[in-house]
């Protein structure tokens, strides 16, 4: 009964530093809260990029201070990441928790490899 | 560095109650689910419970469901167990565990010992 | 509740010698919610394996795990004095989180 979670393998960001993906799950029971996580993984080192909870039918709703917003529908999530910097190439995880009813069930995405360009700087006009 | 060190432990008549503590530092506490994982004497590791994130969910074992209760102060960076209802058979070590952001136990304590007798 | 099996329950071996410990469960695991850990007498448990195969900080190479659905395998392929302790797997993909009775490894 393990939670399968399927994401893209790769993804580049915009111009603009902005990547987005969809984080879908095969949930194995009905749960009505569910969590979402996005993890960065470089090296051996995990490191929390967002987080947030949501009721089954509502709204999937990140920290004020998050570099993610999000959608939800079914047992899909859009997960938009902004903000993104060269330095900030890497693989990205979507983890999700069915956190209620009982029993909890832990699902780990294979994880998605974001790349990030840095924009050219305008050359000055005359 | 991250560390978990229990407290609480002692000898305790059956039928009566006791409160574990496990202060935690050197991680963001509010990020992790926290675990109860304890060890009767010469026997296995057996789950106890969890609570996860900000406090609103948790699990239970079988076996203290409904006699034990798991919670946590994530402002004081403490996780607690309230044990009520003791019997023999919960005599054990009561290891404090961090549950990494990808599942697996990653960070124990060096355990409290609950003795339960009469 | 997914119940793990671990066999055998005692291996007795010398140093430099390989050991071959194997954990069952009842029901399929996914590869990345399986983890080993390793207990010494009086001490707390320390993680060696998660995911079923991924080495966590610190622990030797001689340290191997692999397998997929039921059966999973932790190998340590030459024994130190060091290593001879009671070893765990347990499943951490769902709520009640199991642990393996255990397998102890003593010398021979």
């Known amino acids: 009964k393990a939670m399968h979670v399927a994401q893209p393998a790769v993804v580049l960001a915009s111009s603009r530093g902005i990547a987005s993906f969809v984080c879908e799950y095969a949930s194995p029971g009905k749960a009505t809260e569910v969590r979402v996580t996005v993890l960065r993984q470089a090296d051996s080192q995990v490191t929390e990029v967002c987080a947030a909870t949501y009721m089954m039918g509502n709204e999937l709703t990140f920290l004020d201070d998050s570099i993610c917003t999000g959608t939800s529908s079914g047992n899909q999530v859009n997960l938009t990441i902004q903000g993104l910097r060269a330095m900030d190439t890497g693989l990205y995880i979507c983890k999700v928790e069915l956190m209620y009813p009982p029993p909890y069930y832990l699902g780990i995405g294979n994880g998605t490899q974001i790349y990030v360009i840095d924009p050219e700087p305008c050359p000055d006009s005359d | 560095q991250v560390q978990l060190v229990e407290s609480g432990g002692g000898v305790v008549q059956p039928g009566r109650s006791l409160r574990l503590s496990c202060a935690a530092s050197?991680?963001?506490?509010?990020?992790?689910?926290i675990h109860w994982v304890r060890q009767a004497p010469g026997k296995g590791l057996e789950w106890v419970a969890v609570?996860?994130?900000?406090?609103?969910?948790?699990n239970y074992a079988d076996s203290v469901k409904g006699r034990f209760t798991i919670s946590r102060d994530n402002s004081k960076n403490k996780l607690y167990l309230q044990m009520n209802s003791l019997r023999a058979e919960d005599t054990a070590v009561y290891y404090c565990?961090?549950?990494?952001?990808?599942?697996?136990?990653?960070?124990w304590g060096q355990g409290t010992l609950v003795t339960v007798s009469s | 509740e997914i119940v793990l099996t671990q066999s055998p329950g005692t291996l007795s071996l010398s140093p430099g010698e390989r050991a071959t410990l194997s954990c069952r469960a009842s029901q399929s695991v996914s590869s990345s919610y399986l983890a080993w850990y390793q207990q010494k007498p009086g001490q707390a448990p320390r993680l060696l394996i998660y995911g079923a195969s991924s080495r966590a900080t610190g622990i030797p190479d001689r340290f191997s795990g692999s397998g997929s659905g039921t059966d999973f395998t932790l190998t340590i392929s030459r024994l130190e004095p060091e290593d001879f302790a009671v070893y765990y797997c347990q499943q951490y993909g769902s709520s009640p989180f199991t642990f393996g009775p255990g397998t102890k490894v003593d010398i021979k």
């Open positions: 050197g991680f963001t506490f509010s990020s992790y689910g």
């Open positions: 609570t996860w994130y900000d406090g609103s969910n948790k």
């Open positions: 565990v961090r549950g990494e952001l990808l599942g697996y136990f990653d960070y």
